[in-house]
Every structure is written in structure tokens, then in C-alpha cells.
């Protein structure tokens, strides 16, 4: 008889999860030779150890510490790019601007990007049927705790001028409940981070408003200033042109505003 399995509200573990994590680790070390010291089998074992056989609503940041230790990486000062609700453009940007890094450009973020996973208490099985949903089931689930852990670490290690890309099309351009708003903002270290520069990405072609004056941006500025970090904000009116100008800065049309 099939054993009873807890039914959660979220989708189950991504198919081929172990194979995907191991393959991504191998790919990452291939194209980032500075990470060749990383043993991918050990990385998978540490990843697995964080959630296998554990009740998936009782995962802690401590569970992920062995993995975090194995995936230790540093970003040069002034090269950290945070993002909120605008992942694709942030990744398109770092694909072109190769010396800047989002969390998903780092080993641990790359391993887990777009994946879902969870186990079950007291069994070595991975649950491919369902996993806890953050809202409907619990916040201390394997995926949410992972991203909270690695996001905290990513923010803690940032230095110099930190950039953040924000989605100007959303009702809350800065959302206190996002990972950026609830974790990263509060873990930037004032003794290492001189400034946070927000890039507000406009959605509409004809949108010429100064979204840096948005109340939620003012709220972000207040939080950051209280932490003794300077705050700057820029409107990116034309994201397509912005990317094109990052690719070809000499283009004559790039001398005007974007």
C-alpha cells in the first residue's frame, strides 16, 4: 500500500530536482573557473541535508548553513545588483554587464533559481506531489527559508554602492514584504555600503512621470537613510534602450536620456 503523504497547497518538487541541482553545479564550475574548488557532489549532499527527512514547515536558516559554507563567494565592491519583481530584466542586464552580479549569478542562487523542493518528516523521500505554500501553509518551508538565507548573506556581503532594480509598473514599486524589502534592505551593512542606488524601471512607452517621487520610494529612502546609507534614485524610462546602451555605449542615441 502507498504510504500516507501530507497534502500541501503548493506545487511539488520540480521533476529531476537532484539531477538538475547537480548539473547546474557542474555547469557553474565549468564557466566560473574560480569556483572549481567546489565539489558538486558535496554541494548536493549539503542541499539535500537541509530538507530531507525534516518536517517541511519547520525548516530553519541553520539547516542551510553547511550549503552556505560550501557556496561561499564574494562580489567585488560596487558590483551587487539586487532586484524586486523584475528578475528577467535584472538577469538580461548582468548577461550584458558581465562585471555585475545578481544573487542568481552566484552559485547558490543559480542552483535553486525557479526550482521547488521539499521532503517529508522521517523519510528519505523527496515530495514530488506537493510542497508547502508560503501563504496557505507556512513560511518556514524549504524554498522560502533557502531564499531568505541566501538573500540575507548576499546583502550582508555587499559593499560600496549597491544597485537595486525595481518594477515601476507595480502598485507598490517598493514592497516592504518582498525579499528585497523584508530581508536585503535590513541586512546591508552601513560600515561597508556607502549608498543604495535604485533604478526604477518604467513599463509604458509614454510614461514620463518621475517615479522616484513615488511614496513607496520615499519610504525606501527613509529606511535606508535611517541606516546611515545614502540613497539615490534613477528613472529608467526605456528599459529596451537601456539594455541596448549597456551593450553599445558608443551609440549616438545613448548620449541622450534613457
Amino acid at each position: 500500500l502507498p504510504r500516507w503523504r501530507q497534502q500541501w497547497s503548493g506545487s511539488g518538487t520540480t521533476s529531476r530536482f537532484p539531477e538538475t541541482v547537480l548539473a547546474r553545479c557542474v555547469k557553474y564550475t565549468e564557466v566560473h573557473p574560480e569556483m572549481r574548488h567546489v565539489d558538486c557532489q558535496s554541494v548536493w549532499d549539503a542541499f539535500k541535508g537541509a530538507f530531507i527527512s525534516k518536517y517541511p514547515c519547520n525548516i530553519t536558516e541553520e539547516d542551510y548553513q553547511p550549503l552556505v559554507k560550501l557556496g561561499t563567494q564574494t562580489v567585488p565592491c560596487n558590483k551587487t545588483l539586487l532586484w524586486s519583481r523584475i528578475k528577467d530584466l535584472a538577469h538580461q542586464f548582468t548577461q550584458v554587464q558581465r562585471d555585475m552580479f545578481t544573487l542568481e549569478d552566484m552559485l547558490l542562487g543559480y542552483l535553486a533559481d525557479d526550482l521547488t523542493w521539499c521532503g517529508e518528516f522521517n523519510t528519505f523521500e523527496i515530495n514530488y506531489q506537493s510542497c508547502p505554500d508560503w501563504r496557505k501553509d507556512c513560511s518556514n518551508n524549504p524554498v522560502s527559508v533557502f531564499w531568505k538565507t541566501v538573500s540575507r548573506r548576499f546583502a550582508e556581503t555587499a559593499c560600496g554602492v549597491v544597485h537595486v532594480m525595481l518594477n515601476g509598473s507595480r502598485s507598490k514599486i517598493f514592497d516592504k514584504n518582498s525579499t528585497f524589502g523584508s530581508v536585503e534592505v535590513h541586512n546591508l551593512q552601513p560600515e561597508k555600503v556607502q549608498a543604495l542606488e535604485a533604478w526604477v524601471i518604467h513599463g509604458g512607452r509614454e510614461d514620463s512621470r518621475d517615479l522616484c517621487q513615488d511614496p513607496t520610494i520615499k519610504e525606501l529612502e527613509s529606511i535606508i537613510s535611517k541606516r546611515n546609507i545614502r540613497f539615490f534614485c534613477k528613472n529608467i524610462y526605456r528599459p529596451d534602450k537601456f539594455l541596448q546602451c549597456v551593450k553599445n555605449p558608443e551609440d549616438s542615441s545613448c548620449l541622450s536620456g534613457i
Epitope: 529531476r16 547537480l22 548539473a23 547546474r24 555547469k27 573557473p33 572549481r36 558538486c40
Partner: antibody, heavy 120, light 107 residues
Framework: EVQLVQSGAEVKKPGATVKISCKVS????????MNWVQQAPGKGLEWMGW????????DVAEKFQGRVTITADTSTDTAYMELSSLRSEDTAVYYC?????????????WGQGTTVTVSS | DIQMTQSPSSLSASVGDRVTITCKAS??????VDWYQQKPGKAPKLLIY???NDYTGVPSRFSGSGSGTDFTFTISSLQPEDIATYYC?????????FGGGTKVEIK
């Protein structure tokens, strides 16, 4: 069995563009980076660039930047290498190649090669 | 870019002879050097990876050694089927770079 099968030979005029394909089988396409290597007649091997098919992220050697575009189609398990503004010195055999887990970072798997001739 | 200087560019030896090819990297590449055999009209074939590891199915007469900047590839007893061009490649840093090749012929 891992296989990398490349498209057939091409003859192109200077200034034209060539697009070579590399269709894979025997493994999950998105699980490995695909590399491209050039070999001009009587010359050695030159690494051109790579693509991570899962994300479409690429890196191209400086010598080929601006002329080489590497893409991947995960629906057909096929990688592509496009070389534009062709000149006579681009006459070469082009290979796709990939690594194997636990065999360092060399290339145990290669396509059979695609000959590109650039001639007016 | 890291230069891989391979020597000799060609050699002629008798069947049963010991053949040695060297590769010198312009900077430290640890042990990230691979050796390939290429026969006319064919794709290269991986023989040795990470300086000294035999790839699966490769005859034991092929071996490699070295680390840092100096690497050696050896055929302990040359066979007629070993007529080919041999290349070293460093896989330590992007871009990967190859040596100029050594053409091996039978006397």
C-alpha cells in the same frame, strides 16, 4: 549514448552569414554547457564560446565578439552558432563540444564537424 | 589570454618508440590541462584530462604529467594507429586555449 550531430557543409560568399546547428541526444540538453571550437585548414583548434542552454547565457571569445551569436532551442535539443560578416579566413571546420561530469573540464564529446568555405 | 606553447610541432618515430610531447603555459593553470588526439577528417578525441587522468577506454600507453606551467604527454610504445596530431588545451581560465599541435608520424 551521447551524440552531437552537426548540420552539413556550407559554401558562403564574403560578407554573408552562416548558421550551424548541433543536435544532441542521449542526455538532457539543459544539463550541460555547449562549446564551439574552430579549426582553420592546417591550423590548430580555437575555442569560440559557450552557451548554457537552460538560460541562454553565453560567453564568446574576444576574437569572435560582435560576429558570433550562440543560441539554443530547448524544444529541439539543438544548439546553434551563427557567424556573420564572413571573410576568407573564416574558412574552417566548426565543432560543437561538451564536457562530462567527473572528467575534468576537457571535451570528451564532439560533433562530427561542419565545414564552412568562404569564397567569392 | 593564456598561451600554450607546444613542442615539437612534428616528430617522426619508429613503432615501439617512446614519444614525448611538452606543453608550456604562459601562466599557472594548476593541473587543468587536457590532451587530445586528432586524425585527419575527424573530431579531436580526449585522451588525458586534468594533466594525468586517462579518459575512459584510452589505452594505457598514453599518459600525462605536470602541473603549474609545464606539462608532458607520453606515448610509451608508439603504435601505427597512433599516427595523428596531438593537442594540449588549458581549461583553467576562459578563454580555453590550445597548443599549436604536434604531428606524429612513423619512420
Amino acid at each position: 549514448e551521447v551524440q552531437l550531430v552537426q548540420s552539413g557543409a556550407e559554401v558562403k560568399k564574403p560578407g554573408a552569414t552562416v548558421k550551424i546547428s548541433c543536435k544532441v541526444s542521449g542526455y538532457t540538453f539543459t544539463d550541460s554547457v555547449m562549446n564551439w571550437v574552430q579549426q582553420a585548414p592546417g591550423k590548430g583548434l580555437e575555442w569560440m564560446g559557450w552557451i548554457d542552454p537552460e538560460y541562454g547565457r553565453t560567453d564568446v571569445a574576444e576574437k569572435f565578439q560582435g560576429r558570433v551569436t550562440i543560441t539554443a532551442d530547448t524544444s529541439t535539443d539543438t544548439a546553434y552558432m551563427e557567424l556573420s560578416s564572413l571573410r576568407s579566413e573564416d574558412t574552417a571546420v566548426y565543432y560543437c563540444a561538451r564536457t562530462k561530469y567527473n572528467s575534468g573540464y576537457g571535451f570528451p564529446y564532439w560533433g562530427q564537424g561542419t565545414t564552412v568555405t568562404v569564397s567569392s | 589570454d593564456i598561451q600554450m606553447t607546444q613542442s615539437p610541432s612534428s616528430l617522426s618515430a619508429s613503432v615501439g618508440d617512446r614519444v614525448t610531447i611538452t606543453c608550456k603555459a604562459s601562466q599557472n593553470v594548476d593541473s587543468d590541462v587536457d590532451w587530445y588526439q586528432q586524425k585527419p577528417g575527424k573530431a579531436p578525441k580526449l585522451l588525458i584530462y586534468k594533466a594525468s587522468n586517462d579518459y575512459t577506454g584510452v589505452p594505457s600507453r598514453f599518459s600525462g604529467s605536470g602541473s603549474g606551467t609545464d606539462f608532458t604527454f607520453t606515448i610509451s610504445s608508439l603504435q601505427p594507429e597512433d599516427i595523428a596530431t596531438y593537442y594540449c588545451m588549458q581549461s583553467n581560465t576562459h578563454p580555453r586555449t590550445f597548443g599549436g599541435g604536434t604531428k606524429v608520424e612513423i619512420k
